[in-house]
């Protein structure tokens, strides 16, 4: 059937529409297009005789029409008057006529709408506002947007006049938003510019900031007032009911106790005619003096003296606070506070009690800190240390020994050789030493303030021959896969090379072996039972060499999973059962047995004479190493057959 399709059906003014012909018959003589629903010569647009390639414009031709070989009609620059029906009249070769009608609708391209309002400055909780979308356009749909969102559901929002008017009843400040209207028809949609609703409101109850109400004498008082209001509120300040000034901020420099009182902020909105006030009470306190610390002992002696620190001045009804090293006081039996916290006593002072110490006086507003005080604790001397640590020297070298002892005030030093005073210096220097310089070298440290003295003696051997070294160990019984062992070759000697042997061989390459301290120390990480070997260290210089006695490393290990022998598991009734348990372990483990879960004897061998089928069951051997703290076990099933029955065969 011949049909006409309009593409598009809804056409915008100025655009074009194609009347597309479907199912055009074969063998045509010609066809004509007419405006309207019927064939009317006065309303012919175009006629066409097939094959002439010459279409003839009719009375209704406007110059905007183009006809195509497939009979489709294109109309350009569409105008409102083009709306309606179009009829195609087809004349077939047998002169039989066929007709089809199509239609389209023309809509104007909508203009950009605008919003008019009946109230430009509505008052909150009082007024209503009606927005109207202009212009009024036929066949247009009206939509509204608030902050670019569709209208919220609200009993205060009402659409009327075909949705052209939006009314907001009883406006609130939250209605202050961007409002847009949109017009739509089948061919276009246009949005207005946004209109911002200006809702007059407030003032709300003002807030005074800052919130603090207590001040110190001599400070500046700076109060600010704010109240939500549109238009912005006008502010006035009253102190104790007396008007001060019409500003949002109130500033009073260098306040005194006399400035205490009630401070009122009044906010006024000239458009709504409303006033609101807020009152705050300000208290001004007198400024306390800056505290300072006094001490009953300016140079206390360590472990002998106590020190009492007192926070001055004494003020009634005041809280005293203390800090040590900028921290609050630690809990310590050596620290005591008096009842009023004003005096801090340090019992039996140590060198670590130097401070600094601060005290503070707390009032209603703040804490005033004293300047820090540092204690001069007299201590020492501690046992002096002589360096370097070498004890063996070769003839001809220079001997340079230095002595140091922790002490306050710093210690005075003296050197003695074999009991004879040498010099009163911290360092002792002897050039080009010989075997005669061997002996006992004593450093004496003296603290003149405490009167205490301490000495350290070092044996110095000057010899071309090196002594026989020895090996010291930090762990005599290391546990396998757990401990590390550090061997050190003694003594420490100057210009000496240190060597190590294991079982008479040079050290193997292993990530678990590490040499340090000039090869003087050999560390074995994560020891294993295989490390239980003979270790020898050697020392050598250009003149001599010497080796230590071997030290055998005793590695604690195990117990490993035990083995029960013999391996047999089937026995004949009447035989003797003699099971032996063994587990690799250092030291040897303790053994115990369980039969079917029941504890038996604590022996390495389990013996049962003349067994019967009643002795069937599970035999467990438990091993325990008290040194490593480790345990292990194994279970064996024993089957006893009645005599005359071969193991594995049933009668």
């Amino acid at each position: 059937k011949l049909t006409i399709e309009s593409t598009p059906f809804n056409v915008a003014e100025g655009k074009e529409v194609l009347l597309l012909v479907h199912n055009l018959p074969q063998h045509l003589f010609g066809y004509s297009w007419y405006k309207g629903e019927r064939v009317d010569g006065n309303r012919q647009i175009i006629g066409y005789v097939i094959g002439t390639q010459q279409a003839t414009p009719g009375p209704a031709y406007s110059g905007r029409e183009i006809i195509y070989p497939n009979a489709s009609l294109l109309i350009q620059n569409i105008i409102q008057n083009d709306t309606g029906f179009y009829t195609l009249h087809v004349i077939k070769s047998d002169l039989v006529n066929e007709e089809a009608t199509g239609q389209f609708r023309v809509y104007p391209e909508l203009p950009k709408p605008s919003i008019s309002s009946n109230n430009s400055k509505p008052v909150e909780d009082k007024d209503a506002v009606a927005f109207t979308c202009e212009p009024e356009t036929q066949d247009a749909t009206y939509l509204w947007w608030v902050n670019n969102q569709s209208l919220p559901v609200s009993p205060r929002l009402q659409l009327s006049n075909g949705n052209r008017t939006l009314t907001l009843f009883n406006v609130t400040r939250n209605d202050t938003a961007s409002y847009k209207c949109e017009t739509q028809n089948p061919v276009s949609a246009r949005r207005s510019d946004s209109v911002i609703l200006n809702v007059l409101y407030g003032p709300d109850a003002p807030t005074i900031s800052p919130l603090n109400t207590s001040y110190r004498s001599g400070e500046n008082l700076n109060l600010s007032c704010h109240a939500a209001s549109n238009p912005p509120a006008q502010y006035s300040w009253f102190v104790n009911g007396t008007f001060q000034q019409s500003t949002q901020e109130l500033f009073i420099p260098n306040i005194t106790v006399n400035n205490s009182g009630s401070y009122t902020c009044q906010a006024h909105n000239s458009d709504t005619g409303l006033n609101r006030t807020t009152v705050t009470t300000i208290t001004v306190y007198a400024e306390p003096p800056k505290p300072f610390i006094t001490s009953n002992n300016s140079n206390p002696v360590e472990d002998e003296d106590a020190v009492a620190l007192t926070c001055e001045p004494e003020i009634q009804n005041t809280t005293y606070l203390w800090w040590v090293n900028n921290q609050s006081l630690p809990v310590s039996p050596r620290l005591q506070l008096s009842n009023d916290n004003r005096t801090l006593t340090l019992l039996s002072v140590t060198r670590n009690d130097v401070g600094p110490y601060e005290c503070g006086i707390q009032n209603e507003l703040s804490v005033d800190h004293s300047d820090p005080v540092i204690l001069n604790v007299l201590y020492g001397p501690d046992d002096p240390t002589i360096s370097p640590s070498y004890t063996y020297y070769r003839p001809g070298v220079n001997l340079s020994l230095s002595c140091h002892a922790a002490s306050n005030p710093p210690a005075q030093y003296s050197w003695l050789i074999d009991g004879n005073i040498q010099q009163h210096t911290q360092e002792l220097f002897i050039s080009n030493i010989t075997e005669k310089n061997s002996g006992l070298y004593t450093c004496q440290a003296n603290n003149s303030a405490s009167g205490h003295s301490r000495t350290t003696v070092k044996t110095i051997t000057v010899s071309a021959e090196l002594p026989k070294p020895s090996i010291s160990s930090n762990n005599s019984k290391p546990v396998e896969d757990k401990d590390a062992v550090a061997f050190t070759c003694e003594p420490e000697a100057q210009n000496t090379t240190y060597l190590w042997w294991v079982n008479g061989q040079s050290l193997p390459v292993s990530p678990r072996l590490q040499l340090s301290n000039g090869n003087r120390t050999l560390t074995l990480f994560n020891v294993t039972r295989n490390d239980a070997r003979a270790y020898v260290c050697g020392i050598q210089n250009s003149v001599s060499a010497n080796r230590s006695d071997p030290v055998t490393l005793d590695v604690l290990y195990g117990p490993d999973t035990p083995i029960i022998s013999p391996p047999d598991s089937s026995y004949l009734s009447g035989a003797n059962l003699n099971l032996s348990c063994h587990s690799a372990s250092n030291p040897s483990p303790q053994y115990s047995w369980r039969i079917n879960g029941i504890p038996q004897q604590h022996t390495q061998v389990l013996f049962i004479a003349k067994i019967t089928p009643n002795n069937n069951g599970t035999y467990a051997c438990f091993v325990s190493n008290l040194a490593t703290g480790r345990n292990n076990s194994i279970v064996k099933s024993i089957t006893v057959s009645a005599s005359g029955t071969s193991p594995g065969l049933s009668a």
């Epitope: 390639q53 279409a55 006809i67 195509y68």
Partner: antibody
Framework: QIQLVQSGPELKKPGETVKISCKAS????????LHWVKQVPVKGLKWMGW????????TYADDFKGRFAFSLDTSASSAYLQIHNLKNEDTATYFC?????????????WGAGTTVTVSA | DIQMTQTTSSLSASLGDRVTISCRAS??????LNWYQQKPDGTVELLIY???RLLSGVPSRFSGSGSGTDYSLTIANLEQEDIATYFC?????????FGGGTKVEIK
């Protein structure tokens, strides 16, 4: 794009024959009529007639009956203008044009023109 | 045959000028009047058909008007590229006939 491409200039003696070609592209050649227009510098443009590209039937304006012939090669989308027994007054530029529309009272596409010079 | 007359064979104008070219038919041609532009290199283009319909791609400074026997082509704001000869053509009755042309030059 839609275009008509014409053959190059011709220099002929009186009494000879000339054949000008016009090749169409960018549309279905047999859908729309093809017209020929003569331009003499002094006398302006003169419509010579047209040919039905579907049937090959020519139509000539009164002044161009006799020595003038329109023809087609639809397989090549080409039309031809042949002038027999050339005269000096045939010296002109000849344009092919098409409405590219069934409404052929205007010509939307023109060839670049072919200049024919007839001189002894 | 319908005679088409362009009384002005040439005119001079300045760039930016408004230029109007007229065309008269020997009888009523019922708006079937077309305008063509021929550039100095000889190429011909359709500008306006059916008195006032602007062909797609033609600048909007060109416009056409008229009815009955009197028609005109207006160039609102003459540009350098508009230097050409303009022909009118009637499409009411065969044979189609052209005006003699109006040549537009720069002063």
């Amino acid at each position: 794009q839609i275009q008509l491409v014409q053959s190059g200039p011709e220099l002929k003696k009186p009494g000879e024959t000339v054949k000008i070609s016009c090749k169409a592209s960018g549309y279905t050649f047999t859908d729309y009529s093809l017209h020929w227009v003569k331009q003499v510098p002094v006398k302006g443009l003169k419509w010579m007639g047209w040919i039905n590209t579907e049937t090959g039937e020519p139509t000539y304006a009164d002044d161009f009956k006799g020595r003038f012939a329109f023809s087609l090669d639809t397989s090549a989308s080409s039309a031809y203008l042949q002038i027999h027994n050339l005269k000096n007054e045939d010296t002109a530029t000849y344009f092919c044009a098409s409405p590219v529309s069934l409404l052929f009272y205007y010509f939307t596409v023109w060839g670049a023109g072919t200049t024919v010079t007839v001189s002894a | 045959d319908i005679q088409m007359t362009q009384t002005t064979s040439s005119l001079s104008a300045s760039l930016g000028d408004r230029v109007t070219i007229s065309c008269r038919a020997s009888q009523d041609i019922s708006h079937f009047l077309n305008w063509y532009q021929q550039k100095p290199d000889g190429t011909v283009e359709l500008l306006i058909y059916y008195t006032s319909r602007l062909l797609s791609g033609v600048p909007s400074r060109f416009s056409g008007s008229g009815s009955g026997t009197d028609y005109s082509l207006t160039i609102a704001n003459l540009e350098q590229e508009d230097i050409a000869t303009y022909f009118c053509q009637q499409g009411k009755t065969l044979p189609w006939t052209f005006g003699g042309g109006t040549k537009v030059e720069i002063k």
